[in-house]
Amino acid sequence: LVVTPPGPELVLNVSSTFVLTCSGSAPVVWERMSQEPPQEMAKAQDGTFSSVLTLTNLTGLDTGEYFCTHNDSRGLETDERKRLYIFVPDPTVGFLPNDAEELFIFLTEITEITIPCRVTDPQLVVTLHEKKGDVALPVPYDHQRGFSGIFEDRSYICKTTIGDREVDSDAYYVYRLQVSSINVSVNAVQTVVRQGENITLMCIVIGNEVVNFEWTYPRKESGRLVEPVTDFLLDMPYHIRSILHIPSAELEDSGTYTCNVTESVNDHQDEKAINITVVESGYVRLLGEVGTLQFAELHRSRTLQVVFEAYPPPTVLWFKDNRTLGDSSAGEIALSTRNVSETRYVSELTLVRVKVAEAGHYTMRAFHEDAEVQLSFQLQINVPVRVLELSESHPDSGEQTVRCRGRGMPQPNIIWSACRDLKRCPRELPPTLLGNSSEEESQLETNVTYWEEEQEFEVVSTLRLQHVDRPLSVRCTLRNAVGQDTQEVIVVPHSLPF
């Protein structure tokens, strides 16, 4: 077949006339949209057949595919057919009209489809949008065919701009018919069971009418078959469940349980597996370390957490100094044990606005009929230090003494410092640290007492200054793990009135 002009794509002017010629060794015919438009057929003296299609007064609606084929019933092969695509840019035609069935696109599986919105001008920029969205979708466009890609079940429209007006196509509706994609889910009532307890597994598939369930499980290999039960769930159609129930489990029933589901229509299948552990008896075991000494800060809230594994579910008790704790009505203590996975638990003791009296020996005990575990720790209440007293005195010996007294938990450290230049200190000059130096200028004496009832340390430190010849700023700083406190006093020479 010979087509003149050869194409494969032509751009023709609106209102013009154009002639297409096709010739071949047998009778030929032009086809447009599966029909034969009026055309002139002839046979030349040399035996060549031809057909002339004259397109007059062209409009945008003449845009599209034109085929030349052999016009006989010999069923010639498809390559004996020439395709030509003609564009007739026409500003009065936006998108080419579609048949109603072209607006509804049905799919039975995930596959590439074409949304057939076509324009008359190959130079126009065309974009694809969800019907209710402005954002253009990143899908490739072919001016001869439309947008091709994988689409979700949505409504789509095409947009283009002709001159200064925006033109929308009809809406295209994509429907995905869920025939037979199989998606299996498997779960167990418990994945850990004790010897003698039941194993119950469920395999669920949705949306398929004809399915076959096949289970593989440790007991099956040893020839002991269990008959599964198929349950048609009633909350929605084709929600089918297979239940495998093994009464009185044995240790050998531990292992992998697999549910394989096949669908006979398209021979699709899917399988999922789950591991089951049969234990001789129950267990409780601690996970992670909890230090034997724990800290809480006075008047702050503190949560103490213990993580453990157990089966079957255990009873959890907390004790303080061997007395059972419970949630207090005043809301000072809160106890909670959470099941964070099938066999993992988190038990928490929360002390709200911690008081000194809450220091002591704490124990968490988790137990059931088969096993128990306990964890103990000492809770220390940390109290920020505070300087309670800083005083200066002039004993008869001629030396001058400064006494600093403070409290805190854990035991506070005491730091003495002095500053001789009152104008520049401490902003410009760092204070000088004082203590038991080799020089005889100052001497330090510190005593520490632990007060059992208040559960804190008291520090009393006396600084002896030998020669004070000008005013001196003396600072006492107490420091511990949870804070520091400072006071200062001005020490003046004996000779100067204060």
Partner: antibody, heavy 119, light 106 residues
Framework: EVQLVESGGGLVQPGGSLRLSCAAS????????MAWVRQAPGKGLEWVAS????????YYRDSVKGRFTISRDNAKNSLYLQMNSLRAEDTAVYYC????????????WGQGTMVTVSS | DIQMTQSPSSLSASVGDRVTITCQAS??????IAWYQQKPGKAPRLLIR???TLESGVPSRFSGSGSGRDYTFTISSLQPEDIATYYC????????FGGGTKVEIK
Amino acid sequence: EVQLVESGGGLVQPGGSLRLSCAASGFTFSNYGMAWVRQAPGKGLEWVASITNSGGNTYYRDSVKGRFTISRDNAKNSLYLQMNSLRAEDTAVYYCARHTPGANYFDYWGQGTMVTVSS
Amino acid sequence: DIQMTQSPSSLSASVGDRVTITCQASQSIKNYIAWYQQKPGKAPRLLIRYTSTLESGVPSRFSGSGSGRDYTFTISSLQPEDIATYYCVQYANLYTFGGGTKVEIK
């Protein structure tokens, strides 16, 4: 031939209890989900409760949850509806119906039993 | 919960007339709708399932159509034995019946 025969209906005072039964024959009972559907005098049909073929799952309309219990005995080919805390608005003909496996629409119905709740 | 609105609630037609009943769901029910016929004092009888599939033994004058939320039940040529109340029911998510349509002969 599939047959469903309901029994157990009658007159009961508000707050009282009643147990309906449905005897099934002509099909393998344990392969089918079953349901109770009711119809108040002069009114339309109303689904009440369903139970899966194994008896492992039950479903109820909101207005009867906590008051009605659907159960079955596959060995006896029987379906039951235990109705407690009955109210005047529970007065109806109660039909036993069979679910078709998988699709779940009701394919066969019994002739119904009348429950009247009145003081 | 899915609601089913059935209309009309009653209609009167002559023998041979075409009768149409509609049911609208409050959300898409994916063609999971069935139609039942109930005669006075009798149990309901299944006529159509999955929108348009006729049960065996049901005369071909009964038909169903629709998709998404909107469904139609049609009797192409009303016969005297068709006097009954007709119900739709959705089974996409549990079960909800329409209010029923009583069909009478003029």
